[in-house]
């Protein structure tokens, strides 16, 4: 039994982690600077998307890049419980805190702000430079989706790395996982064409959920051959005249649930991966 | 002046490097196994490409993946001159060999076979599983293109890493370079739409040349809406009916030079990067 409550321990761990973050700002500032620069570069490359076939390609391309970038950037989250492993074991044995206090304290002070920031920065820079769908809900859905991708990818990193002593193996494993997840995200292969004995793998792909949600959010209601007389039979000359046609070809459900089910899936993954990470820390404590 | 000729030294360095490679086969065998597994996985995912709009997406996707995979796999080439840096300086000072003998010896025995193998394996597995263009010339052009991409990416790795003492910085720099090169390769963004003040960057992108060559080789002459009822008005429903239409939309020159200029560019990059790597080794020797 502990003399201090869970909440007190949680506050204490969070405070210390946050102080460490502010006391060593180089890493955080560097991450922000890199995110801003990358956001501006992406914004410049894709500046002012057209509403034609190149507009379809460029929209899909930038959304894919943002999704996969969020995943690969999250590989750095493997360090969260690895670098402080010895300190955690020492302090836990000494009765400083519960495993749960340490776990949630680190998440709240470190993971939450450091994974939220890139999503906000990317969305704010890229959205307006590219001229994505000009509605407030679409803007915030994109921001929320990128956050969810970052959190689920980071959670997976924690689940793989928690309790390990070296970062390199976890990093390699994460990278391999994300490469396969990237293939199944829906840009490099049309998911409707994959053989049934393999297609189930798409449901384990974090970027697939993020990319699908971002596409649903951006393409729905878009017109990619504007100016054509819609009454004339020949409007059929364009393979993909509407965002709906494009989404249907990609096998994406057009209903609102077709959007939100991706966030539900990512939320489930976050819960599952964080549970695994927590159990690994508990398991670690038993063998310490 | 040296008592032994350049050729004798070259043979000696090559022989030793090759013996090291065979004496420690785990790395080589592991690379071959990983390549075979990845080839089979890619073959299974994209098995039997269709001749419709999904066929266009899947062809472009797999060719993009193979190109970028060749690039990122070549990052490991940074080790070639780094891990033996001290040994090289010691042996060079002791008058064992010329810099040129060591340089070309290492290239011939280590870089040449280890970068050629994945290209051959990938092509042999993927080509027939996917059902790419069934002509011998197209098969060998794909193999040659993947080799050229691997060699130019590896040459870039050598140019960055030669003379350095630690692998990590060079690896990070290579990865960042390849991420930007990947954006400019032509799948994630339609290169015809990039602003002129930025579009020149595409000419420094290794995967862009590889991806363009692979697409030219595969798409030319392909029919992506075959067998449509020729009298029905809706036959025009397909935006991209031929490989030529697709290539033109991507800004790819349809002439034979449109294919071979990519290999010429890659060859020029190989020469430039290897020259830089060689000069860095020469420069290193002066300061040893």
């Amino acid at each position: 039994s502990y003399t201090t409550s869970f909440c007190h321990q949680l506050r204490w761990v969070s405070k210390r982690s946050f102080k460490n973050l502010l006391g060593n700002p180089q890493a955080s500032i560097a991450q922000i600077i890199v995110t801003v620069i990358l956001g501006l570069v992406i914004g410049a490359i894709y500046f002012g998307l057209n509403n034609d076939s190149t507009g379809i390609q460029n929209r899909a391309g930038v959304l894919f890049f943002l999704t996969t970038n969020q995943c690969f950037s999250s590989v750095s989250a493997v360090e969260l419980f690895v670098v402080e492993k010895k300190l955690f074991i020492h302090e836990y044995i000494s009765g400083y805190y519960r495993v749960s206090s340490y776990f949630f304290g680190k998440l709240l002070s470190d993971l939450l702000p450091m994974r939220m920031l890139p999503s906000i920065i990317f969305t704010c820079i890229v959205y307006f430079m590219l001229g994505l769908k000009p509605t407030a809900d679409a803007f915030f859905i994109m921001m929320f989706t990128l956050m969810m991708v970052a959190y689920s990818a980071s959670s997976m990193a924690l689940a793989i790395a928690a309790g390990q002593s070296v970062v390199s193996v976890a990093t390699l494993l994460m990278t391999i996982c994300f490469v396969f997840m990237m293939i199944f995200s829906g840009l490099l292969v049309n998911l409707t064409t994959i053989a049934s004995w393999l297609s189930w793998l798409q449901y384990f792909s974090i970027p697939r959920y993020g990319f699908t949600a971002l596409q649903h959010n951006e393409f729905l209601g878009q017109n990619f051959c504007p100016g054509l007389n819609a009454t004339v039979n020949n409007t059929c000359n364009y393979a993909t005249c509407t965002g709906e046609e494009y989404l249907t070809k990609q096998g994406i459900d057009l209903s609102p649930w077709g959007l939100w089910k991706n966030h539900v899936a990512l939320a489930c993954m976050i819960v599952i991966f964080l549970t695994i990470a927590y159990l690994k820390l508990l398991f670690l404590k038993k063998y310490s | 002046s040296y008592t032994t000729s350049f050729c004798h030294q070259l043979r000696w360095v090559s022989k030793r490097s090759f013996k090291n490679l065979l004496g420690n086969p785990q790395a080589s065998i592991a690379q071959i196994i990983v390549t075979v597994i990845l080839g089979l996985v890619i073959g299974a995912i994209y098995f039997g490409l269709n001749n419709d709009s999904t066929g266009i997406q899947n062809r472009a996707g797999v060719l993009f993946f193979l190109t970028t995979n060749q690039c990122f796999s070549s990052v490991s080439a940074v080790e070639l001159f780094v891990v033996e840096k001290k040994l090289f300086i010691h042996e060079y000072i002791s008058g064992y060999y010329r810099v040129s003998s060591y340089f070309f010896g290492k290239l011939l025995s280590d870089l040449l076979p280890m970068r050629m193998l994945p290209s051959i394996i990938f092509t042999c597995i993927v080509y027939f599983m996917l059902g790419l263009k069934p002509t011998a010339d197209a098969f060998f052009i794909m193999m040659f293109t993947l080799m050229m991409v691997a060699y130019s990416a590896s040459s870039m790795a050598l140019a960055i890493a030669a003379g350095q003492s630690v692998v990590s910085v060079a690896t990070l720099l290579m990865t960042i370079c390849f991420v930007f090169m990947m954006i400019f390769s032509g799948l994630l963004v339609n290169l015809t739409t990039i602003a002129s003040w930025l579009s020149w960057l595409q000419y420094f992108s290794i995967p862009r040349y590889g991806f363009t060559a692979l697409q030219h080789n595969e798409f030319l002459g392909q029919n992506f809406c075959p067998g449509l009822n020729a009298t029905v008005n809706n036959t025009c429903n397909y935006a991209t009916c031929t490989g030529e239409e697709y290539l033109t939309k991507q800004g790819i020159d349809l002439s034979p030079w449109g294919l071979w200029k990519n290999h010429v560019a890659l060859a020029c990059m190989i020469v430039i990067f290897l020259t830089i790597a060689y000069l860095k080794l020469l420069f290193l020797k002066k300061y040893s």
Epitope: N234, N237 | N223, P226, L228, A230, C236, C241
Partner: antibody, heavy 118, light 106 residues
């Protein structure tokens, strides 16, 4: 009903340019499809030459790419074939047709015989 | 280019006969094959596409079959108006035509 009619000189001198016109009625060439030229040589061999699509995109047979040009006049609903540096080997009956891409040709003109001779 | 070889180059048959014309492709063309009929001084007329799909307005006595590289056009009961030259066309990779089979009545 779509109708295609070829017109142009029946005799062309070697090294000169062959120019043919295809007039389309019953369908607007900018509305859809690819408007194609095909030729049939005296020995019955048939060759696809190239097309101009509804969007203005042109696609040519690689063996002819250096000397062929297909253009259109949308106001007159016509498309044209120009073949440069002709030889006696270019003697054939030239047809204009409508399809999409390389697909089967359901609509043909009646054909026009062009002889290349000095 | 995919070379298309038609045989025979000349075929004589009697009215009412079942006639088969052959077309061989230089490589697999995924059943993307069409047949045309061309009468003297006329434009070719599309009979069959996708190996076995009958074009609208074409009599049902014409049928197509085959797969891979070997294809046939069959006229179940030859009629006098079927005298013509028949061409095959592949449209799998670019488009190429056979050299034709001239069909005449004995």
């Amino acid at each position: 009903e779509v109708q295609l009619v070829e017109s142009g000189p029946g005799l062309v001198k070697p090294s000169q340019s062959l120019s043919l016109t295809c007039s389309v009625t019953g369908y607007t060439i900018t509305s859809g499809y690819d408007w194609t030229w095909i030729r049939k040589f005296p020995g019955n061999k048939m060759e696809w030459m190239g097309y101009i699509s509804y969007s203005g995109f042109t696609n040519y047979n690689p063996s002819l790419r250096s000397r062929i040009s297909i253009t259109r006049d949308t106001s007159k609903n016509q498309f044209f074939l120009q073949l440069n540096s002709v030889t006696t080997e270019d003697t054939a009956t030239y047809y204009c047709t409508r399809t999409r891409g390389y697909n089967p040709f359901a609509y043909w003109g009646q054909g026009t015989l062009v002889t290349v001779s000095s | 280019d995919v070379v298309m070889t038609q045989s025979p180059s000349l075929l004589s048959a009697s009215v009412g006969d079942r006639v088969t014309l052959s077309c061989k492709a230089g490589r697999n063309i995924n059943n993307y094959l069409a047949w045309y009929q061309q009468k003297l001084g006329k434009a070719p007329k599309l009979l069959i596409y996708n190996t076995n799909s009958l074009q609208t307005g074409i009599p049902s006595r014409f049928s197509g079959s085959g797969s891979g590289t070997d294809f046939t056009l069959t006229i179940s009961s030859l009629q006098p108006e079927d005298v013509a030259t028949y061409f095959c066309q592949q449209y799998n990779s670019w488009t190429t035509f056979g050299s034709g089979t001239k069909l005449e009545i004995k």
